[in-house]
Structures are given as C-alpha cells and as structure tokens.
C-alpha cells in the first residue's frame, strides 16, 4: 500500500474508561494533528477507517462492527462502545484515507474496573475549591454527547462510598454539586453517576473527581519572609561554616509560581566565585499554602565573605519581597592574661 503519514502512538491521550459503561472516543487526528475537521474530510471524499491491536498482541485487526446490539459502532469521527468490556483494552488506530492521501494515529484505550466505592486505577482530575468562599460548584465531567438534550438523565452524587443526600453544606443540583461553604472536611473523591435510557436499555456514566479545598484568594497575602529576620545575627569566625535559612510563607494562589532566591552582593550565587551551595525544601499546609526554605551554605567562610550582603528574595503573583540577613565576623575574645592585666591597671 502507498505511504501513510503515521503520527505513531499518541500516549499523551491515554484514554481510560469504565467497564460496562458507554464510551465515545473521538479520532484524535482532527483534534490534534490535522488542520481540518471530519466534515471537511468527509466532503473531500476521505474515509475514516478504524482498527485496533489487542493488549499484549502485535497483530492489527479490524474492529468488529457486527456485534450483538451494535456494541461497537462508528458515527462520524467517533468510535462508540455501548458498553465497554475489559478485553476492549488495546491500542486503537484511526486512519483517514483516499487513493491519494493517508494519515493515521494510534492511541491507547484502557478499560478499567471500579468497585462499589468507585475506586479504580482511573487517574482522577482534581478540582480546587476555595475555603469558606461562598457557593462553589463542581460539574459532572465528560458526559456531553452521550445522549440528546431531549433525554433527561438522573444523576446521583456520592462522596466516597455514600450518596450525598441531605448533607449540611453539599447540595446535588442535577449535573452540578454545590458547596455552600467549602471546608477541609469536604476534601475527598466525589462521583456522579448519570443514568440514561437508550433504545430500551439503561446506561450509567460514572465520573469521579477529587476535591481539594485550598486557601481563599480573599485571605491571600504577599510572600512573608520568616527568616532571615532582625532578631537573628549570623556571627561567624573565618573558617567556620555559614548556614543561613531563608524561610518564606506563600498563600495559596491558583496558578501562581512561587519563587525564592538568594543574592550575594546583589548577584545570583551562580554568578560569583564563592563556593556556595543552596538546598531547598518545600512543605504544604492542608489548604496548600506553601512554605519554602532555601538554606545558603558556605563550608569555610572567609572574612571577605562575612562582609558581603546576603539577601533572600521571594515572589508570587501577590508581590515580591526581600530581606537581608545580618551577617558579621565574630570578634575574637581577648587573651585572658591581657584582660587580667588591664583589670589590675598594669601598663
């Protein structure tokens, strides 16, 4: 056969679906690889062909579209399973072609089992809610296109294993779940089960997401440098190790990049000749506020090093701050005999 533009196995689109549930999978060619859509391709006389390779096999096979009750079917650029089975797991290929043109891409499909608490190997999306921020909603994800707007599905929401029924601050509202006042206790996995009829059968769509309650923007502040501060003086003798921690608190801010860095005499440590090392550690509070600590270390400090300016800097979307460490050379203690002699008025 003639050459085909092969986009290979698109592992970025590792698709996971639940066993025994419908799944609709769009050919990724039109979404991510080609500059035209299916309608344009179809109008131009191109045909979309599907085939697959079973898990742990090398043989490409055509997809069987003649199964009972049309369990697997194709509609435009969508491959439908009504429903999926565990052994549908494999690599699926969609190929667009005519006599002069060919383009194809493969993608992995994994059919996973869930237990009665909706635990599974499925990778869960995370939805962040602001703590004590007023009414916030999550929406049952990825259910568009499964049933027409004329069909009114029933939706049951669960927190963990249990139906959300008559909860204090969590209210199911169809496809949405409203949190009246989000609290740390609302952290957890939430599942919507959407039930809809189709051709005399009833199908479930199960969708689970993780809710994480995070710091509110109402409470967000610029970075706070706890150390260095005015109360601690780093007093060293030449030859000793100098250790200065820079500890910074960052309020949680959605999509904010938190940065901490040291300057020595106004330059980044990399840009000067001192033998300096910097180690960073990061910790998070329950609401994802962040504390970053960068410890500046000079193994054997010189008297010149002790005269330099050491400044800790921090930046977030809320602003930038800096604080200088108080570093000085320790004055050697006077020799004992001299001190005594002076004390007795000796000359």
């Amino acid at each position: 056969s003639e050459r085909c533009d092969d986009w290979g196995l698109d592992t970025m689109r590792q698709i996971q679906v639940f066993e025994d549930e419908p799944a609709r999978i769009k050919c990724p060619l039109f979404e991510h690889f080609l500059k035209f859509n299916y309608s344009t391709a179809h109008s131009a006389g191109l045909t979309l062909i599907w085939y697959w390779t079973r898990q742990d096999r090398d043989l490409e096979e055509p997809i069987n579209f003649r199964l009972p009750e049309n369990r697997i079917s194709k509609e435009k650029d969508v491959l439908w399973f009504r429903p999926t089975l565990l052994n549908d797991t494999g690599n699926y290929t969609c190929m667009l072609r005519n006599t002069t043109y060919c383009s194809k891409v493969a993608f992995p499909l994994e059919v996973v089992q869930k237990d009665s608490c909706f635990n599974s190997p499925m990778k869960l999306p995370v939805h962040k809610l602001y703590i004590e921020y007023g009414i916030q909603r999550i929406t049952c994800p990825n259910v568009d296109g499964y049933f027409p707007s004329s069909v009114k599905p029933t939706i049951t929401w669960y927190m963990g294993c249990y139906k959300i029924q008559n909860f204090n601050n969590v209210i199911p509202e169809g496809m949405n779940l409203s949190f009246l006042i989000a609290l740390i206790s609302n952290n957890g996995n939430y599942t919507c089960v959407v039930t809809y009829p189709e051709n005399g059968r009833t199908f479930h769509l199960t969708r689970t997401l993780t809710v994480k309650v995070v710091g509110s923007p109402k409470n967000a502040v610029p970075p706070v440098i706890h150390s260095p501060n005015d109360h601690v003086v780093y007093e060293k003798e030449p030859g000793e190790e100098l250790l200065i921690p820079c500890t910074v608190y960052f309020s949680f801010l959605m999509d904010s990049r938190n940065e901490v860095w040291w300057t020595i005499d106004g330059k980044k440590p990399d840009d000067i000749t001192i033998d300096v090392t910097i180690n960073e550690s990061i910790s998070h509070s329950r609401t994802e506020d962040e504390t970053r600590t960068q410890i500046l270390s000079i193994k054997k400090v010189t008297s010149e090093d002790l005269k330099r300016s050491y400044v800790c800097h921090a930046r977030s979307a809320k602003g930038e701050v800096a604080k200088a460490a108080k570093v000085k050379q320790k004055v050697p203690a006077p020799r004992y005999t001299v001190e005594l002699a002076c004390g007795f008025g000796a000359t």
Partner: antibody
Framework: QVQLVESGGGVVQPGGSLRLSCAAS????????MHWVRQAPGKGLEWVAV????????FYTDSVQGRFTISRDNSKNTLNLQMNSLRAEDTAVYYC?????????????WGQGTLVTVSS | DIQMTQSPSSLSASVGDRVTITCRAS??????SNWYQQKPGKAPKLLIY???SLQSGVPSRFSGSGSGTDFTLTISSLQPEDFATYFC?????????FGGGTKLEIK
C-alpha cells in the same frame, strides 16, 4: 433502631382506591430514598415505586404507572402510596423499604408489610 | 427492563453443606446486584449489596461475587437457620427487578 411500620391495607373492590402509609423511626428519614415492594401470595418480590430522599424523583413499575402515586413527608417521617383503579393482580403484601446509602438502589431495611386484597 | 434469571429455583441441602445460587442479568449491570433472604411470613432481609459487600450483622458464611451479568451467592457452611428463600435483585436501574427466588430446603 430502624423501624418501618406499614398501615392502610385491607380489602377493596376492583376499581377502588386505598392509601398505604409507612411510619419511619430510628434514622434520618430525609437522608434516604424510600421504596414500595410487593409480594403476591406465594409468589416472588416485585418492586413497585421509589421516591428520592428529597422527593425530587419518583419512578414506578410499568404496571402501576398512572394508577399509583408515591409521596413522602419528611417533616413527619412518613411514606405514602396512593393506589387508585385497583385490580385483582394488585393483591399482595406491600412492604415499605429503606434504600441504602451505598451505590445503587437496594433495600437495607424493610417493614413487616401490610396486606392489600382486591376482590369483588 | 433488566431480567434477573435465578437458578436453581429450589435446592435441597444438609447442614454444613456449601451452597451456591446464581443469578444472570439480561444486560451488563457492573456490580449493581444484591441478595436477600426471606423466611415464611417475614419481610426479606438484605444479605449482600453491590455484588460482594456483606451487610452489617450478616454472618460471614454468606458471600457474594460476580460482575457484569453473572452473580453468585455462596453459603460456605449451611446452618439450620439458613433454610429460607433467597432472591437476587438488580439495583442498576428502574424498574428494579428481582430473580424468581431459590427455595433452600433441608435434605
């Protein structure tokens, strides 16, 4: 402890009406879906109707759709089944049952049942 | 509607026996299957929900398994109080449906 007590059963003529009630106690009634299930003499179990915890959804088996109405009063912890246009085949013991809070529609507690006899 | 086909319809066994009752759904229902026990003149009692979860207070000799279309209730060692009728039920979607029942009798 959980208690469900049905009442309102009796003998009624075909075409007649009857209203069954179920008094619930020992649990938070407004947190559970509630169901009616029936059992004809010497036969198996047949699900009749469900009402969601907040009354927002009601579903019925096909044979009673349009004739029976399920309702609840969360302030009084009661479940009702209004049965109209009764037929001989509606003769059964009617159980009210509490829906469990885990996945799916299942019945974790049942009342002792009330007998409805439709006969001329 | 989803049909639940239960077998056998009756079963004779002795105390101490291991007993298995099966139920087949007419369409795939994932784990949405439950088992009940009923004694004459009494209301049914939940034994197993979500295919394999043991209801609180039910003896551990009862177990459930299965997924998709085929489900099993197993009693590992029959006790005298276990002689009763057993029903499976699908909790996947309305109308909810029960199997025809299995009458477990003393041999």
């Amino acid at each position: 402890q959980v208690q469900l007590v049905e009442s309102g059963g009796g003998v009624v003529q075909p075409g007649g009406s009857l209203r069954l009630s179920c008094a619930a106690s020992g649990f938070t009634f407004s947190s559970h879906g509630m169901h009616w299930v029936r059992q004809a003499p010497g036969k198996g179990l047949e699900w009749v109707a469900v009402i969601w915890y907040d009354g927002s959804n009601k579903f019925y088996t096909d044979s009673v759709q349009g004739r029976f109405t399920i309702s609840r009063d969360n302030s009084k912890n009661t479940l009702n089944l209004q049965m109209n246009s009764l037929r001989a085949e509606d003769t059964a013991v009617y159980y009210c049952a509490r829906e469990g809070l885990r996945a799916g529609y299942y019945f974790d507690f049942w009342g002792q049942g009330t007998l409805v006899t439709v006969s001329s | 509607d989803i049909q639940m086909t239960q077998s056998p319809s009756s079963l004779s066994a002795s105390v101490g026996d291991r007993v298995t009752i099966t139920c087949r759904a007419s369409q795939r229902i994932s784990f949405y299957s439950n088992w009940y026990q009923q004694k004459p003149g009494k209301a049914p009692k939940l034994l197993i929900y979500a295919a394999s979860s043991l209801q609180s207070g039910v003896p551990s000799r009862f177990s459930g398994s299965g997924s998709g279309t085929d489900f099993t209730l197993t009693i590992s060692s029959l006790q005298p109080e276990d002689f009763a009728t057993y029903f499976c039920q699908q909790s996947h979607s309305t109308p909810l449906t029960f199997g025809g029942g299995t009458k477990l009798e003393i041999k």
